[in-house]
C-alpha cells in the first residue's frame, strides 16, 4: 500500500511592510491518524520571478522569513515530508503547492527614481542619493524609508539631501547594530498629477563602506637603498585589522603600485641616485571584514626629505 501525505494548507507570502522582508507561512497538512505522531518537515522553495535558481529551505516550522527584491515578483512552493522512521525507511513527500506575491504596478517605470547610490562613510553614516524618474511632473517629490532587523518597523529618513527643494538623497547616522544583516530601502514618491513607482534596494552596510584616507604618512631610507613607508589607519570605528591598502610609489619619473594588509611597507630603491622618492596610499575594508567595499580617497603625497644632491651644499 502506497503511503501518501498531504501538502501544507493555506500557503501564502505576506508583506508585513518591512520593505522586502517577507513572511512565507502555512498551516500543517491534514494528517491521517496513522501518522499523527510523526515529525513533519516542509521543503520550501522560493525565488524572485526573474531568477533561474530556487532557494531551498527545509524546516519543521510553519513560517519562514527572508528578504526579497520587491522590484520584481516572488514565487514559492512547498511540500510536506514524512520522516523515514514513520514510513519504514521510504521517502514520502506530498505534491507541491504554490503561492506568489505580485509587485504593485502603480505608476509607470519612468516615474521611478534612477541611479540610486549608497555609501557608508567610514562605517559611521550612510548617504544615499538618487535622480528623479525620467518622466515626472515638476511637483514630484520622493521619500525614503529604511528597515533592518532590530527595528520594530520601517523608518522614514529624517535628514534629506535636497536640490531645488526636492529630495535627492538621505543621510542616516546612529544606525545601531545594522551591519552584517540585510538593510532594506524603499524610495517612493508623490505627485498630484500621477502615481509614482516605488523603488526597492537591499544591501549590507559593511559592503559599501568608504573609509577615510590613511594619514600621518612617513617615508625613510636606510642604507641608502631600503625604503620604509608607514602610515596610520584613519580615525573612526573601523578596526585596524579590517583594512587593506593600495600604495603608489614614485621614484623620479617611474611610478608603480603595491598592496598590503599592514600599515607599513619595505622595498628597495630602484636607483641609488634617484632625486625624487614619494608615495601616497588609499584603503578599503578587506575580505576578512566585508565581501566588498569602496576605496577611500588617496592620501596626501609624502616625499623623502633625506635626499641631498650635489647642489645642496
Amino acid at each position: 500500500l502506497e503511503i501518501k501525505v498531504n501538502p501544507p494548507q493555506d500557503f501564502e507570502i505576506l508583506d508585513p511592510g518591512l520593505l522586502g522582508y517577507l513572511y512565507l507561512q502555512w498551516k500543517p497538512p491534514v494528517v491521517i491518524e496513522k501518522f499523527k505522531g510523526c515529525t513533519l518537515e516542509y521543503e520550501l522553495k522560493y525565488r524572485n520571478v526573474d531568477s533561474d535558481s530556487w532557494k531551498t529551505i527545509i524546516t519543521r516550522n510553519l513560517i519562514y522569513k527572508d528578504g526579497f527584491d520587491l522590484n520584481k515578483g516572488i514565487e514559492g512552493k512547498i511540500r510536506t515530508h514524512l520522516s523515514e522512521h514513520c514510513t519504514n525507511g521510504s521517502e514520502v513527500q506530498s505534491p507541491w503547492i504554490e503561492a506568489s506575491y505580485g509587485i504593485s504596478d502603480e505608476g509607470s517605470l519612468e516615474t521611478k527614481i534612477q541611479d540610486m547610490k549608497c555609501i557608508y562613510y567610514n562605517w559611521q553614516y550612510l548617504v544615499c542619493s538618487w535622480k528623479p524618474g525620467k518622466t515626472v511632473y515638476s511637483d514630484t517629490n520622493y521619500t525614503m524609508f529604511f528597515w533592518y532587523e532590530g527595528l520594530d518597523h520601517a523608518l522614514q529618513c529624517a535628514d534629506y539631501l535636497q536640490h531645488d527643494e526636492k529630495n535627492v538623497g538621505c543621510k542616516l547616522s546612529n544606525l545601531d547594530s545594522s551591519d552584517y544583516k540585510d538593510f532594506f530601502i524603499c524610495v517612493n514618491g508623490s505627485s498630484k498629477l500621477e502615481p509614482i513607482r516605488s523603488s526597492y534596494t537591499v544591501f549590507q552596510l559593511q559592503n559599501i563602506v568608504k573609509p577615510l584616507p590613511p594619514e600621518f604618512l612617513h617615508i625613510s631610507v636606510e642604507n641608502s637603498i631600503d625604503i620604509r613607508m608607514k602610515w596610520s589607519t584613519p580615525g573612526g570605528p573601523i578596526p585596524p585589522r579590517c583594512y587593506t591598502y593600495e600604495i603608489v610609489i614614485r621614484e623620479d619619473d617611474i611610478s608603480w603600485e603595491s598592496a598590503t594588509d599592514k600599515n607599513d611597507m619595505k622595498l628597495k630603491r630602484r636607483a641609488n641616485e634617484s632625486e625624487d622618492l614619494c608615495f601616497f596610499v588609499r584603503c578599503k575594508v578587506n575580505i576578512y571584514c566585508a565581501d566588498d567595499g569602496i576605496w577611500s580617497e588617496w592620501s596626501e603625497e609624502e616625499c623623502w626629505e633625506g635626499y641631498t644632491g650635489p647642489d645642496s651644499k
Partner: antibody, heavy 121, light 108 residues
Framework: EVQLLESGGGLVQPGGSLRLSCAAS????????MTWVRQAPGKGLEWVSA????????YYADSVKGRFTISRDNSKNTLYLQMNSLRAEDTAVYYC??????WGAGAFDYWGQGTLVTVSS | DIQMTQSPSTLSASVGDRVTITCRAS??????LAWYQQKPGKAPKLLIY???SLESGVPSRFSGSGSGTEFTLTISSLQPDDFATYYC??????????FGQGTKVEIK
C-alpha cells in the same frame, strides 16, 4: 554496532582537490540522511553538507557552496565529499555523521572518528 | 540563518556539582535542539535530542529542557568523566544546520 570510517584526508595545496570517503556499517545505509561536519583546529563545530537517504537532495553551507559536492553510493554503503578549489580556511577535521531521523538533517546520533584535511602551501 | 548562542563559554566546577549550560536561539526552533559532548581529540557524542529526549546509553544525570528560544542542559551531579566541551545544535530550519560556539566544563 554502527560504524563510520572516514578516509581521504591529507595535505593539499590551496586551489587543490581532495575526495573524502566514509564507509558505513551496522545500519541500513539507504534510510537515513547523512552529513559532513568539520572542526577547524581549536574551534567549534561547523556543518558542511547533507544528503537525503536516496541521494536525491543535497544541501550545503554557504562557505563551501559551488566548491564541495556531497554524494552517496547506497550499494556500497559509502558517503563521499568531493572538495575542489580548497582554501586555507577549509583546514579542519572532517566528520562523517549519521542523522538520527529527518529528511536532510536532524540530531546527529553517530559520528566517525574524523579525517584531517590540511590546506597549505 | 538561525544563530545559536551558548553561555557560559567556560565553566569551572567540581565533582558532584550541579551544572547548567544555556543555549539561546535567534528565533523559535520549537523543540528541535540537540546537545553533544566532545572530549579532546574525539568525535562529538549525542546526549540529548528533541530538546529533552535522552539518547540511549547516556547517563540519566544528563537532562535537557526548554522550547522556543531558550534551552538548558543540566548535569545533576558532575562526574570526572563529564569534563569536556558541550555544544547545542538546532535542526528546525536548514541549510544551514547551526551549532552553538561551545561551553568548556573544566575542573575548578
Amino acid at each position: 554496532e554502527v560504524q563510520l570510517l572516514e578516509s581521504g584526508g591529507g595535505l593539499v595545496q590551496p586551489g587543490g582537490s581532495l575526495r573524502l570517503s566514509c564507509a558505513a556499517s551496522g545500519f541500513t545505509f539507504r534510510r537515513p540522511a547523512m552529513t559532513w561536519v568539520r572542526q577547524a583546529p581549536g574551534k567549534g563545530l561547523e556543518w558542511v553538507s547533507a544528503i537525503t537517504g536516496s541521494g536525491g537532495s543535497t544541501y550545503y553551507a554557504d562557505s563551501v557552496k559551488g566548491r564541495f559536492t556531497i554524494s552517496r553510493d547506497n550499494s556500497k554503503n559509502t558517503l563521499y565529499l568531493q572538495m575542489n578549489s580548497l582554501r586555507a580556511e577549509d583546514t579542519a577535521v572532517y566528520y562523517c555523521v549519521k542523522v538520527r531521523y529527518g529528511w536532510g538533517a536532524g540530531a546527529f546520533d553517530y559520528w566517525g572518528q574524523g579525517t584531517l584535511v590540511t590546506v597549505s602551501s | 540563518d538561525i544563530q545559536m548562542t551558548q553561555s557560559p563559554s567556560t565553566l569551572s566546577a567540581s565533582v558532584g556539582d550541579r551544572v547548567t549550560i544555556t543555549c539561546r536561539a535567534s528565533q523559535s526552533i520549537s523543540s528541535w535542539l540537540a546537545w553533544y559532548q566532545q572530549k579532546p581529540g574525539k568525535a562529538p557524542k549525542l546526549l540529548i535530542y528533541d530538546a529533552s529526549s535522552l539518547e540511549s546509553g547516556v547517563p540519566s544525570r544528563f537532562s535537557g529542557s526548554g522550547s522556543g528560544t531558550e534551552f538548558t542542559l543540566t548535569i545533576s551531579s558532575l562526574q570526572p568523566d563529564d569534563f569536556a566541551t558541550y555544544y547545542c545544535q538546532q535542526y528546525d530550519t536548514y541549510p544551514p544546520i547551526t551549532f552553538g560556539q561551545g561551553t568548556k566544563v573544566e575542573i575548578k
